[in-house]
């Protein structure tokens, strides 16, 4: 058993049929010694008396808010949560496996630049009685500071018969140098509590590996005289690290119709303009990627050919 | 420690091409190592990230773009003195800071070159003959060093009398390649910045 926060405790249980469970001793936070009784949740049934209560925690029915009283007055609470371990593996029931970039990916994180600011998100099908708390650091032994905000519900989607909820959090490394060469990874730890179930999820990464620039901005077309070719130009996204001559991007320019199966014109360039062949009912799209360290491409920025 | 904005004529920076070749060569070599040593811990997640130049050179700090010198997190107190002549310095107006930056890059390359050559000598003794260093990568390191053209003491190649542990050598190769790739990215960014200045 360990303390998650004040008056909230996590009991780690090996979860299998007829498991013996864990013996837990609760102590009432009071100077009083006599006339103390214990109850669980909203029940008025007295579980025991005395300053300490010893319980055998085996299942969710044994978890909950234990309260000690004296003469009708509440003295203190202890909330017990369960953390299940099945076949030596901690349960991951609360969050959905996103399977990208690999299986057992519950947290996904992205950074728009090298400033040390990043966003992580996760998915769940649970809609109520759900809380998250996020901590982060650079490195695990002798950790350096990363400050994370509160996790918020950022999107709701319908997937078949189920509703899916996306939560996200923004974090900022306390003293980040965009030019630094990372040798210690960022660690992100999410505590998830659904009703009386506790789970924790972690992710470890270098900012350089989660970079995904915003799409290029200000796409413009200029038809070339006596030609089917057009010159397309664009600018670096505002959120990208500066100076751009140091943090350079490379671009992919594509002309394509509405269907992905349609024919296309595609060219890669380090410049902020390119010449392509425009077709009727097609769009010109441009996306960006760090020129020197190949992490993710940005989303496409598009303009119609016409 | 920073790079001044007034530096060589645009497009005349002779080291940019070599640094691009360097990044390409080390990236290819790292990819080859990951594939060949698939049953060894050779991915970014599996290895310890060590920097053999730590406390010996200060490339990131010495080569910091002027725009980032206002960022206190980027300023490091490490002081390193280097020789200040080099053929990549295409303008007489080149400052001492830029010379310091380029000589720091040169020292990085020299250190990695020695490590890679020592390692290759060990890998050539491996009866499995599983992996060797790409000669192209070694050649590209040499070309960039020649383009930088700094005079400095020759670092003797480390020779070891004991029987090499090939497993450890291959793990060390992965660690070295990952670190060198990261440094090659920094070098490329620096050269691109200088070329544009």
């Amino acid at each position: 058993i360990w303390e998650l926060k004040k008056d909230v405790y996590v009991v780690e249980l090996d979860w299998y049929p007829d498991a013996p469970g864990e013996m837990v001793v609760l102590t009432c936070d009071t100077p009083e010694e006599d006339g103390i009784t214990w109850t669980l949740d909203q029940s008025s049934e007295v579980l025991g008396s005395g300053k300490t209560l010893t319980i055998q925690v085996k299942e969710f029915g044994d978890a909950g808010q234990y309260t000690c009283h004296k003469g009708g007055e509440v003295l203190s609470h202890s909330l017990l949560l369960l953390h299940k371990k099945e076949d030596g593996i901690w349960s991951t029931d609360i969050l959905k496996d996103q399977k990208e970039p690999k299986n057992k990916t519950f947290l996904r994180c992205e950074a728009k630049n090298y400033s040390g600011r990043f966003t992580c998100w996760w998915l769940t099908t649970i809609s109520t009685d759900l809380t998250f708390s996020v901590k982060s650091s650079r490195g695990s032994s002798d950790p350096q500071g990363v400050t994370c905000g509160a996790a918020t519900l950022s999107a709701e989607r319908v997937r078949g018969d189920n509703k899916e909820y996306e939560y996200s959090v923004e974090c900022q490394e306390d003293s980040a140098c965009p030019a630094a060469e990372e040798s210690l990874p960022i660690e992100v730890m999410v505590d998830a509590v659904h009703k009386l179930k506790y789970e924790n999820y972690t992710s470890s990464f270098f900012i350089r590996d989660i970079i995904k620039p915003d799409p290029p901005k200000n796409l413009q077309l200029k038809p070339l005289k006596n030609s089917r070719q057009v010159e397309v130009s664009w600018e670096y996204p505002d959120t990208w690290s500066t100076p751009h001559s140091y943090f350079s991007l490379t671009f992919c320019v594509q002309v394509q119709g509405k269907s992905k199966r349609e024919k296309k014109d595609r060219v890669f360039t380090d410049k902020t303009s390119a010449t392509v062949i425009c077709r009727k009912n097609a769009s010109i799209s441009v996306r960006a990627q760090d020129r020197y360290y190949s992490s993710s491409w940005s989303e496409w920025a598009s303009v119609p050919c016409s | 420690r920073n790079l001044p904005v007034a530096t060589p004529d645009p497009g005349m920076f002779p080291c940019l091409h070599h640094s691009q070749n360097l990044l390409r060569a080390v990236s290819n070599m790292l990819q080859k190592a990951r594939q060949t040593l698939e049953f060894y811990p050779c991915t970014s997640e599996e290895i310890d990230h060590e920097d053999i130049t730590k406390d010996k050179t200060s490339t990131v700090e010495a080569c910091l773009p002027l725009e980032l010198t206002k960022n206190e997190s980027c300023l490091n107190s490490r002081e390193t003195s280097f020789i200040t002549n080099g053929s990549c310095l295409a303008s007489r107006k080149t400052s001492f800071m830029m010379a310091l930056c380029l000589s720091s890059i040169y020292e990085d390359l020299k250190m990695y070159q020695v490590e890679f050559k020592t390692m290759n000598a060990k890998l050539l003794m491996d009866p499995k003959r599983q992996i060797f260093l790409d000669q192209n990568m070694l050649a590209v390191i040499d070309e960039l060093m020649q383009a930088l053209n700094f005079n400095s003491e020759t670092v003797p190649q480390k020779s070891s009398l004991e029987e090499p542990d090939f497993y450890k050598t291959k793990i060390k190769l992965c660690i070295l390649l990952h670190a060198f790739r990261i440094r090659a990215v920094t070098i490329d960014r620096v050269m691109s910045y200088l070329n544009a200045s």
């Epitope: 089917r228 070719q229 490379t250 199966r261 349609e262 024919k263 296309k264 014109d265 595609r266 060219v267 890669f268 360039t269 380090d270 010449t275 062949i277 077709r279 009727k280 | -």
Partner: antibody
Framework: QVQLVQSGAEVKKPGSSVKVSCKAS????????LHWVRQAPGQGLEWMGW????????EYAPKFQGRVTITADESTSTAYMELSSLRSEDTAVYYC???????????LGQGTLVTVSS | DIVMTQSPLSLPVTPGEPASISCRAS??????LHWYQQKPGQAARLLIA???QSISGVPSRFSGSGSGTDFTLTISSLQPEDFATYYC?????????FGQGTKVEIK
């Protein structure tokens, strides 16, 4: 299986024209760009131009501009390359090529040898 | 026009040994570079697109690298069926242009 079948070999006199055909099978004809590339004996490959069969748009290499015409007939899934004012240096194997990507080729025809000789 | 220069023009290799062919562009073409294989009397076949993207059906012993002006096609271990002429082609701008070809022959 995508295939491009070209017309047979031709012998032409200098100053005349030649029209080579390329019939496509497998996949929808208008879903691909069609190019013509030639190879003189013992020489490398030389790009001549492309057509978008969907709308008839064409683009020619400046070297052949005014002498080459590329057309396409969607009803027969056939593309044509006509080269006029032939000279001896036009002796080459002419290949048609196609791809959904405009700037390179994933399928090429078997080639048509055009000999220009007096 | 962008001029593509291949080297060497002829490359004698022992079967089972690796081979590397270089292609240089007269100006920077990013990764807009493709490799083809051509055997005598046959049409060319696409091996690699955009400098390093492998093509389905092409053996994994063929790999490409490079960007900007310098590109390399590598065959990790030459098989008897790999003896052929190899061409690079740039797609950075029209007109599309090819290298002059590298003939890989049995040593």
């Amino acid at each position: 299986q995508v295939q491009l079948v070209q017309s047979g070999a031709e012998v032409k006199k200098p100053g005349s024209s030649v029209k080579v055909s390329c019939k496509a099978s497998g996949g929808t004809f208008s879903d691909y760009y069609l190019h013509w590339v030639r190879q003189a004996p013992g020489q490398g490959l030389e790009w001549m131009g492309w057509i978008d069969p969907e709308n008839g748009d064409t683009e020619y290499a400046p070297k052949f501009q005014g002498r080459v015409t590329i057309t396409a007939d969607e009803s027969t899934s056939t593309a044509y390359m006509e080269l006029s004012s032939l000279r001896s240096e036009d002796t080459a194997v002419y290949y048609c090529a196609r791809n959904k990507e405009l700037r390179y080729f994933d399928v090429l025809g078997q080639g048509t040898l055009v000999t220009v000789s007096s | 026009d962008i001029v593509m220069t291949q080297s060497p023009l002829s490359l004698p290799v022992t079967p089972g040994e690796p081979a590397s062919i270089s292609c240089r562009a007269s100006q920077s073409i990013s990764i807009n570079l493709h490799w083809y294989q051509q055997k005598p009397g046959q049409a060319a076949r696409l091996l690699i697109a955009f400098a390093s993207q492998s093509i389905s059906g092409v053996p994994s012993r063929f790999s490409g690298s490079g960007s900007g002006t310098d590109f390399t096609l590598t065959i990790s271990s030459l098989q008897p069926e790999d003896f052929a002429t190899y061409y690079c082609q740039q797609s950075n701008s029209f007109p599309l242009t090819f290298g002059q070809g590298t003939k890989v022959e049995i040593k």
